[in-house]
Interface confidence: low
Amino acid sequence: APRGTQAEESPFVGNPGNITGARGLTGTLRCQLQVQGEPPEVHWLRDGQILELADSTQTQVPLGEDEQDDWIVVSQLRITSLQLSDTGQYQCLVFLGHQTFVSQPGYVGLEGLPYFLEEPEDRTVAANTPFNLSCQAQGPPEPVDLLWLQDAVPLATAPGHGPQRSLHVPGLNKTSSFSCEAHNAKGVTTSRTATITVLPQQPRNLHLVSRQPTELEVAWTPGLSGIYPLTHCTLQAVLSDDGMGIQAGEPDPPEEPLTSQASVPPHQLRLGSLHPHTPYHIRVACTSSQGPSSWTHWLPVETPEGVPLGPPENISATRNGSQAFVHWQEPRAPLQGTLLGYRLAYQGQDTPEVLMDIGLRQEVTLELQGDGSVSNLTVCVAAYTAAGDGPWSLPVPLEAWRPGQAQPVHQLVKEPSTPAFSWPWW
């Protein structure tokens, strides 16, 4: 800190006074000095440190007509709203020639009613859920004792006897108000009143009850809602997208969700008009007269696949002796899911039909029993997804193989020795 020298008489003719008051007080500190020649700039120190951003003004009045005559300089430091950080020792400092001069100190102190550093805040809490409220106050004068009040009723017999900075509330079943009183030698200060709104608990166990290609039925268990009955629950569904990063704690979906309201009870809702074989994320919140619960985490769900909407295309069935070669192409109609394979049914005029699961191949060779004398053999093919069969093709009669026709080589699938189905199948 700068040090004044006493080699010459101090120029200060006035030093800062003392200010003691309550928070928020406005006050002014002044220094006055008389110097010969050009007046210097006055700096303010607090506890020995220069205040760079002090709210100060300086006035200079010459005592004579000559520039070299004496000047009276007054510097004023304004403290606009007294805070604890303003307290300390204040001095003025000037540089004159090669010397530094410091005024005598003044003191700024704080004393009065307690001051709240932290007050209870309005908040929402889930019913029957523990939470904490904070309150912090200081003097001077110390000590400061706190008294908590719930709905204007003290929670302790006397200040300082109950919880102090933190009040633990084990849970509420109705919306309540909390405040805090701070007591010191100068008196009592009351904090703001915080309203703690009791909302329903987050629903639990959001789960699928049933799935269909274009609808999902979901159910959940409602949380407690205190004395306030639930009025409705809101379900949101959003199309999942690998790149969208829905996380358990993410507050908002990345796109506009599909929102549905369910009157309660029952705590169940059927979501319709969905896409088949499509991943969604869903969440639910329930509302009482006090407001909505928090959302559940996003639950990934998926509509099941639908069946293909059309039969396989371009089916051809060719016979060559005791073998029949059948091939086809994927349906042009939407598959509504992942194609898992094809089923083929064939039947002769006087023989039971046979149903085969071909897998994903698009051709099959049937090894016919006997000498190939089965007459009027017809073949039907259907594509299937996880949801089941699509429509079967119209029966395709076997054509006799003509020389020159290509016939790919592939695995033979033999007909069971005892055919086993009623025709038509489905």
Epitope: L340, Q411, V413, T418
Partner: antibody
Amino acid sequence: EVQLVQSGAEVKKPGATVKISCKVSGYSFTGHTMNWIRQPPGKGLEWIGLIKPSNGGTSYNQKFKGRVTISADKSISTAYLQWSSLKASDTAMYYCAHGHYESYFAMDYWGQGTLVTVSS
Amino acid sequence: DIQMTQSPSSLSASVGDRVTITCKASQDVSSAVAWYQQKPGQAPRLLIYWASTRHTGVPSRFSGSGSGTEFTLTISSLQPDDFATYYCQEHNSTPLTFGQGTKVEIK
């Protein structure tokens, strides 16, 4: 949770008819097939037939055709197996089983079984 | 009909043993074979389908292999809960047929 709940045990005289039921829950009844399988006491499994509840299409094991009728009631998600002209050799545990979505013919969920006893 | 022949019809083994059950189809069934486990008084439970695909919730000690006409179910380390009867079944075409079963007993 997928559940298949079958009707209770039956005792029948030879020549009689029995009808047993299989009520399903936990999945879309009409989107899958229901198989029926039987197992005589101390013996292996024997496939009887299946139904696609969405349209009532059926397939039967030729061995039992004519004596067996498989049906379904979509409105109550229930499949039925009716067996006529019962013989003592038809004494068995009868199971319904849900066809796996990747192959109708592999059975992923089974009922608890219905014991049918044929005795004079 | 396709016949499915299982072997052995029964076997005795100890906890921790590696157990192999085979199943032969009378004709090529591609890879359309399922394996089931059945305990006394209970319905069968699907273990494997399409020869080697484990059904949901089936422990990894169960594995299946094979194609064409020869198929195998392997239990890599037999557990007390695994003593049961095992059936193979072709799921290629109807009528569906099962093997006669393999009973795995405690040695």
